[in-house]
């Protein structure tokens, strides 16, 4: 790849289905805008979870996504995904694109583990 | 002498903090005395969880202990730790020694990685 | 799908201004740097200029500096490329090309004469 | 500036055949470890089609039978069996950082023979 991402292995979702990890990128140039994307593997096919373009003056992405949000600081993404089920457990990868100025740089991380457990409902109170 | 013993790569716990994961050794060998251990490893060091002795007719093992239930059957442990808690996360080694006849075999797994998480207490009720 | 679709090309009097659009669809358009290319006929490949994904930056090739303007909407997923000073050697399909190059319009022709 | 000269500027070829295009910088793209060349297929009143980026790695969706290769200023494509499909004109392109351009190539037209 022609930047190096790196990311957690492994990330436990909160007993609320929050998951928070970092996306880090080497080396991470002079760029402006930098798109970063959230994808989950599920056998042999991913598929997007989210995706923004940060820049130096818009730092907090994801805004058009519920389930995910992000702050942006130099090379370093702090992801949150929230929402998560049990069923939600997976391999989620971070991509990274040096967006602009060029030359265009992309990178993927190995991906994060995260796992998530459904918590016991409370019982009904009388 | 060795023998081959698997055990799941990651196992969650529920929220109850109940991890259940099947030990199985090869070759399996014809074996009165199986003693099975669960070890847990903290850095560079391991603690011995529960340990117990499966027989042809004690098929019910680790009554000494409160966190540890199993069961044997053939050349299979299924193994259930309870109580746990999120400072319990960590990897679960299970040791297999074919005790009686002779000759010895001893196996150990890789380990299972139990991961934990807390519940969110309830909210009280009025 | 991804669908880029240049318009506003056509006949243009030498000396006059053209401004074309590049009409994005099929991606989230605000996420990508997007380039002006444009081919005379019967010619090679020509690159014009990038704007980033907020339209916060551009970079133009040296020839076009001070002559070009690219511009975008995101609102609107709308790029624009305006030329001025218009001369018969800025006859030409002009493209409009998903940053890196990976997707690509059809075309839009601009023929300057008199 | 850096120029692109590529080789032949029109060859004639037969399905089956294998076919290399060169491309020759006047001076290395190569950049942070990368070269910045990519390779274009276009066929007459179609925009151009990426085949390979980075010198060597395959745009999605390309066949296998395209392939790239070379680093600083010596590039070359190839199209290993020749398709009656692959009849086009090819072009390449290279990123130079200084100043921030890209610049194409002349074009390689592959006819049938």
């Known amino acids: 790849e022609a930047i190096q991402v790196t990311q957690p292995s492994v990330v436990l979702a909160s007993s609320h289905g929050v998951a928070s990890f970092p996306c880090e990128y080497s080396p991470s140039h002079n760029t402006d805008e930098v798109r970063v994307t959230v994808l989950r593997q599920t056998n042999d096919q991913m598929t997007e979870v989210c995706a923004t373009t940060f820049t130096e003056k818009n730092t907090v992405g994801f805004l058009d996504y519920p389930f995910c949000s992000g702050t942006f600081n130099e090379s370093r993404v702090n992801l949150t995904i929230q929402g998560l089920r049990a069923v939600d457990t997976g391999l989620y990868l971070c991509k990274v694109e040096l967006m602009y100025p060029p030359p265009y740089f992309v990178g993927m991380g190995n991906g994060t583990q995260i796992y998530v457990i459904d918590p016991e409902p409370c019982p009904d109170s009388d | 002498e060795a023998i081959q013993v698997t055990q799941p790569s990651v196992v969650l716990a529920s929220s109850h903090g109940v991890a259940s994961f099947p030990c199985e050794y090869s070759p399996s060998h014809n074996t009165d005395e199986v003693r099975v251990t669960v070890l847990r490893q903290t850095n560079d060091q391991m603690t011995e969880v529960c340990a117990t002795t499966f027989t042809e007719k004690n098929t019910v093992g680790f009554l000494d202990y409160p966190f540890c239930s199993g069961t044997f059957n053939e050349s299979r442990v299924n193994l259930t730790i309870q109580g746990l808690r999120a400072v319990d996360t960590g990897l679960y080694l299970c040791k297999v020694e074919l005790m009686y006849p002779p000759p010895y075999f001893v196996g150990m797994g890789n380990g299972t990685q139990i991961y934990v998480i807390d519940p969110e207490p309830c909210p009280d009720s009025d | 799908e991804v669908q880029l679709v240049e318009s506003g090309g056509g006949l243009v009097q030498p000396g006059g201004s053209l401004r074309l659009s590049c009409a994005a669809s099929?991606?989230?358009?605000?996420?990508?740097?997007i380039h002006w290319v444009r081919q005379a006929p019967g010619k090679g490949l020509e690159w014009i200029g990038i704007?980033?994904?907020?339209?916060?930056?551009?970079k133009y090739a040296q020839k076009f500096q001070g002559r070009v303007t690219i511009s975008r909407d995101n609102s609107k997923n709308t790029l624009y490329l305006q030329l001025n000073s218009l001369r018969a050697e800025d006859t030409a399909v002009y493209y409009c090309?998903?940053?890196?190059?990976?997707?690509w319009g059809q075309g839009t022709l601009v023929t300057v004469s008199s | 500036d850096i120029q692109l000269t590529q080789s032949p500027s029109s060859l004639s070829a037969s399905v089956g055949d294998r076919v290399t295009i060169t491309c020759r910088a006047s001076?290395?793209?190569?950049?942070?470890?990368?070269?910045?060349l990519d390779w274009y297929q276009q066929k007459p009143g179609k925009a151009p089609k990426l085949l390979i980026y980075?010198?060597?790695n395959r745009a999605t969706g390309i066949p296998s039978r395209f392939s790239g290769s070379g680093s600083g200023t010596d590039f070359t494509l190839t199209i290993s069996s020749l398709q009656p499909e692959d009849f086009a004109t090819y072009y390449c392109?290279?990123?130079?950082?200084?100043?921030?351009?890209?610049?194409f190539g002349q074009g390689t037209k592959v006819e049938i023979k």
């Open positions: 090309a998903r940053h890196p190059f990976a997707y």
């Open positions: 099929g991606f989230t358009f605000s996420g990508y740097a």
């Open positions: 704007i980033s994904p907020s339209g916060g930056g551009t």
């Open positions: 001076q290395s793209v190569d950049f942070y470890g990368i070269s910045f």
């Open positions: 980075d010198a060597s």
């Open positions: 392109q290279q990123y130079v950082s200084s100043p921030p351009e890209y610049t």
